[in-house]
Amino acid sequence: SEVEYRAEVGQNAYLPCFYTPAAPGNLVPVCWGKGACPVFECGNVVLRTDERDVNYWTSRYWLNGDFRKGDVSLTIENVTLADSGIYCCRIQIPGIMNDEKFNLKLVIKPAKVTPAPTRQRDFTAAFPRMLTTRGHGPAETQTLGSLPDINLTQISTLANELRDSRLANDLRDSGATIRGSSDYKDDDDKHHHHHH
């Protein structure tokens, strides 16, 4: 089943997809499409890379990572509810039926309006059930979804997970392999978003 990612209306959505080039500079063509991965190619292509660069994209879709190192994670700018749905990341490895294909489900939620607290009574008043991570790009703050009441230790653990999981992924894999899909599975309480 698809791995689920969440973002709020008006924010940037981030859909992770990685592979390890066989050698530096040996890039593999990649396509991103709206809709589940078909047998070949991508349906409704929104972005495409080749062995050299990003050679096709549509408005609001771009790669904010180092695609020359195999980080082909998709950023969707300023999302609306209409951006919800399945996205396909396809690593087009040369050879017959060698492609790696991954379906990622994007769930867009209405923007949260969090009233500013009048005074900091306790931790949950100051940080009401929301944790964000910030990327370099404009408006690239995304929520981790609704959390139960949690303490500082748990927040720290979540923040460390966010920071460390990308590094762990980078160290774990080798060869022309995709990573990110099963590694970023959500549970009921946590929605992992990874940023630069």
Partner: antibody
């Protein structure tokens, strides 16, 4: 050490062609794209095209697609850029340059010394 | 093609000053921006690649920041040998395009 050594200055008449060479040494020639960039007198930098010597695959700036041809000779580690139907506004310094990730993902970026091409009647 | 708008086109600063140059891409280019230094009669020299990474042998007073469409190049303490023209270049999608350049002079 890495070196890109270009051919000498050229003076051409309008409508003629010029072929500039760039001899590479100090690295594996076939592993990196060779780019060609030009700079008109007192102006900025303009990318013309690139080529990957291992298979001859190239990409061109649309502006130059009909007039420029890139080739390589892997036996001598030399890249060539030919520009046809020269006009006076083609007067510029032409650079070869190679860049990309090398071993251990260290970025690799080297430029030739430049070749002045003057187009004048 | 992706247009790169660099500003200012020229600036004059004193030795030791902090100098900042900006580069704006017409479309998002992720991290794929490079900064070059060019002295008169010389080939361009790479200073920064992938927006923030310092090229080998480049002094640490040079730095870069940004991603997406907005990028900044900084010389933390201007030195006499930094007199040159500086160019940004996007390496996200070909044709690779350059900014118009910023000429840096000493007051």
């Amino acid at each position: 050490q890495v070196q890109l050594v270009q051919s000498g200055a050229e003076v051409k008449k309008p409508g003629a062609s010029v072929k500039v060479s760039c001899k590479a040494s100090g690295y594996t020639f076939t592993d990196y794209y060779m780019n060609w960039v030009r700079q008109a007198p007192g102006q900025g930098l303009e990318w013309i095209a690139d080529i990957i010597p291992n298979n001859g695959g190239s990409k061109y700036n649309q502006k130059f697609k009909d007039r420029a041809t890139l080739t390589t000779d892997t036996s001598t580690s030399t890249a060539y850029m030919e520009l046809r139907s020269l006009r006076s506004d083609d007067t510029a310094v032409y650079y070869c340059a190679t860049w990309g990730y090398g071993s251990s993902y260290r970025w690799f970026d080297y430029w030739g010394q430049g070749t002045l091409v003057t187009v004048s009647s | 093609d992706i247009q790169m708008t660099q500003s200012p086109s020229s600036l004059s600063a004193s030795v030791g000053d902090r100098v900042t140059i900006t580069c704006l891409a017409s479309q998002p280019i992720g991290i794929w921006l490079a900064w070059y230094q060019q002295k008169p009669g010389k080939s361009p020299k790479l200073l920064i690649y992938a927006a923030t990474s310092l090229a080998d042998g480049v002094p640490s007073r040079f730095s870069g920041s940004g991603s997406g469409t907005d990028f900044t190049f900084t010389i933390s303490s201007l030195q006499p040998e930094d007199i040159a023209t500086y160019y940004c270049q996007q390496l996200y999608s070909s044709p690779w395009t350059f900014g118009g350049g910023t000429k840096v002079e000493i007051k």
